[in-house]
Amino acid sequence: MPSWALFMVTSCLLLAPQNLAQVSSQDVSLLASDSEPLKCFSRTFEDLTCFWDEEEAAPSGTYQLLYAYPREKPRACPLSSQSMPHFGTRYVCQFPDQEEVRLFFPLHLWVKNVFLNQTRTQRVLFVDSVGLPAPPSIIKAMGGSQPGELQISWEEPAPEISDFLRYELRYGPRDPKNSTGPTVIQLIATETCCPALQRPHSASALDQSPCAQPTMPWQDGPKQTSPSREASALTAEGGSCLISGLQPGNSYWLQLRSEPDGISLGGSWGSWSLPVTVDLPGDAVALGLQCFTLDLKNVTCQWQQQDHASSQGFFYHSRARCCPRDRYPIWENCEEEEKTNPGLQTPQFSRCHFKSRNDSIIHILVEVTTAPGTVHSYLGSPFWIHQAVRLPTPNLHWREISSGHLELEWQHPSSWAAQETCYQLRYTGEGHQDWKVLEPPLGARGGTLELRPRSRYRLQLRARLNGPTYQGPWSSWSDPTRVETATETAWISLVTALHLVLGLSAVLGLLLLRWQFPAHYRRLRHALWPSLPDLHRVLGQYLRDTAALSPPKATVSDTCEEVEPSLLEILPKSSERTPLPLCSSQAQMDYRRLQPSCLGTMPLSVCPPMAESGSCCTTHIANHSYLPLSYWQQP
């Protein structure tokens, strides 16, 4: 069992039972809205305490508190007194016997001055309307199944009434610098919760309610940067609730209180429980955690190794429910693999693997132990094995049909999921560092590509699953395919020569025109060459905006790869052909549903790799080769 699991147990707090004989100043303040001079409250609806204050001191035995249920003889309630500094005396009666506390029938109470034989004050109440519940007695707090989630469960001092109470949770970061103040949330019973103490009569909504979809193990959700008051979603039922939207890796304190529901039972909010503290595990995204399977049986997880620290992976399987059946999951060791350090620029990666099941949600935890022995836990987002299928690297084949005109073909790495496989093809001119990326339609098996003649290129292909059945991260790029486009034929050269002669003549003529007749020259220039927009200025903001939508991610791969390329999609030229859906358009639609997307791991960037910040240079290929993609070959 990892040491992280211990914090689930250590943050459990057992509260001491309240001393019911005394009335605290807190009780008095909680009943401040009760205008009756004789105030009464019940902690469990099986007890009753009544009290009133007298300004003037009176001899012992002056007052008597009498009570009677309908048609019964009045009885006296034994009184105790508390001296009130700067005020006088508080008289308190705790009903001596549970038999004397009856719900749902009017209880007549009156205070009598025995010496004067006068009724000082009187009241009729229903014990079921004067609840002042004691706070939940046992509070357990632990991390939920997603980063930033907190699972809280509690026990009621009086379990038989817990169905008729509503709860409020107050919490905040333990470090006050991180917050503007505590957050208070009413715990609303909903169907997406995890009941910790489910009673037999309450119908479980877990099986019929839609559970939140597990997110993809290779995708990073939006990072929470604001350290101030977190917006959080919360679900509750019975003795349990789940808060989400907290800052992973932070420490929180929390308190609970309860109030009669106002439907079956009435009363006031009770006091807050003593604070419980809990440390949330960090988000494994920070470690660049990526998990995948190649065979739908074994799962491999990898993450960046921290300097001067050791790390260990853990996993557990939970059934396809909103919440794990077991409140305290048993984390199993993920079998460690050899550490890899393929390149100097790449951080060292830790890898581990384990056998998985296809009928369960997979939960991953990474524990990092620093040199002083401090253990930091990082939680991955849960996923199904079929959402983490990594394809083998595809093979790319090409042949040149005519000068600069390439016919490309590739084999589907997985024939069983051909229609769910999407590809990315990237190419770059020799000597250039930046890549142009093309996305064929989903399921395409090839296509044609027009490149500049007499040029050298490198082409690479990668694949990923993005269908209704299977999804997963990108495969690694195929080995670079080197292409040298052919020289044009003689007659093309002749045409080129003619073009050159005519071109030179035109340039000379224009220069003469510009020198002799400048106004005519400007008109002619505008007619022949309308001003073209600066593509980088035009596209720059689009690229920056899109980049903001897809935050950069620490991508983990087998080999030291180039920085992720800029995404530039080139559509088929012919308008009569209806192109098949592209991976990226599919992806943008799916992204909102937390489904994997082909854009998921591709940060958009206008800078080539290794460019210094603020020194973005132009993309050479984008400047030279806006050539059409003739067609994509369908299966």
Epitope: P70, F104, F105, R123, F126, S264, G266
Partner: antibody, heavy 117, light 107 residues
Framework: QVQLVQSGGGLVRPGGSLSLSCAVS????????MHWVRQAPGKGLEWVAG????????YYADSVQGRFTISRDSSKNTLYLQMNSLRAEDTAVYYC??????????WGQGTMVTVSS | DIQMTQSPSTLSASIGDRVTITCRAS??????LAWYQQKPGKAPKLLIY???SLASGAPSRFSGSGSGTDFTLTISSLQPDDFATYYC?????????FGGGTKLEIK
């Protein structure tokens, strides 16, 4: 959802007896007040009897004291009204109802009792 | 026994009218008073409890006020569904007693 389903009732001769039942479902609280209320044809509502569901307290209207008995069976979650020595003025629709600090919030569908020779 | 006197016994009003029904207890009952609505052949339905608290499921156009001995039920804007008989009931002491009822009719 709390439900009160009534049964019994019917035609009975003066001096005769009849038992009414009220099956309670959906209430899980340890104890709660249950009552019988009646309404003579064309008249107003009249409270008849009440009992705490732990059986410790029973209350009756003066008009039925000594003739009617309210009881409950916790194992069956059922409320009863045993009516003896019935009179013509007992003819009414009888309702069972749950009562507490909020009055009678849940009512049965009613059952007709006719006392006639 | 505590007597509950309701007035008027019959009330004619039009849709959209503001309507008030009063109930007086023969002795002080604090705020332990409920109002019910009953339609022919149906069981009564709780509208107001503890003199002024709106019962679950009751429309917000219904409101109650009063304490001690004098109480009122107000319907802010009469709707077609509101034509029925209304009863007040004290539950401060036993025997529990109802008012004689107010029949609300269409004018």
């Amino acid at each position: 959802q709390v439900q009160l389903v009534q049964s019994g009732g019917g035609l009975v001769r003066p001096g005769g007896s009849l038992s009414l039942s009220c099956a309670v479902s959906g209430i899980t609280l340890r104890t709660y007040g249950m009552h019988w209320v009646r309404q003579a044809p064309g008249k107003g509502l009249e409270w008849v009897a009440g009992i705490s569901f732990d059986g410790r307290s029973e209350y009756y209207a003066d008009s039925v004291q000594g003739r009617f008995t309210i009881s409950r069976d916790s194992s069956k979650n059922t409320l009863y009204l045993q009516m003896n020595s019935l009179r013509a003025e007992d003819t009414a629709v009888y309702y069972c109802a749950r009562g507490a600090h909020y009055g009678f919030d849940i009512w049965g569908q009613g059952t007709m009792v006719t006392v006639s020779s | 026994d505590i007597q509950m006197t309701q007035s008027p016994s019959t009330l004619s009003a039009s849709i959209g009218d503001r309507v008030t029904i009063t109930c007086r207890a023969s002795e002080g009952i604090y705020h332990w008073l409920a109002w019910y609505q009953q339609k022919p052949g149906k069981a009564p339905k709780l509208l107001i409890y503890k003199a002024s608290s709106l019962a679950s499921g009751a429309p917000s156009r219904f409101s109650g006020s009063g304490s001690g001995t004098d109480f009122t039920l107000t319907i802010s804007s009469l709707q077609p569904d509101d034509f029925a008989t209304y009863y007040c009931q004290q539950y401060s002491n036993y025997p529990l007693t109802f008012g004689g009822g107010t029949k609300l009719e269409i004018k």
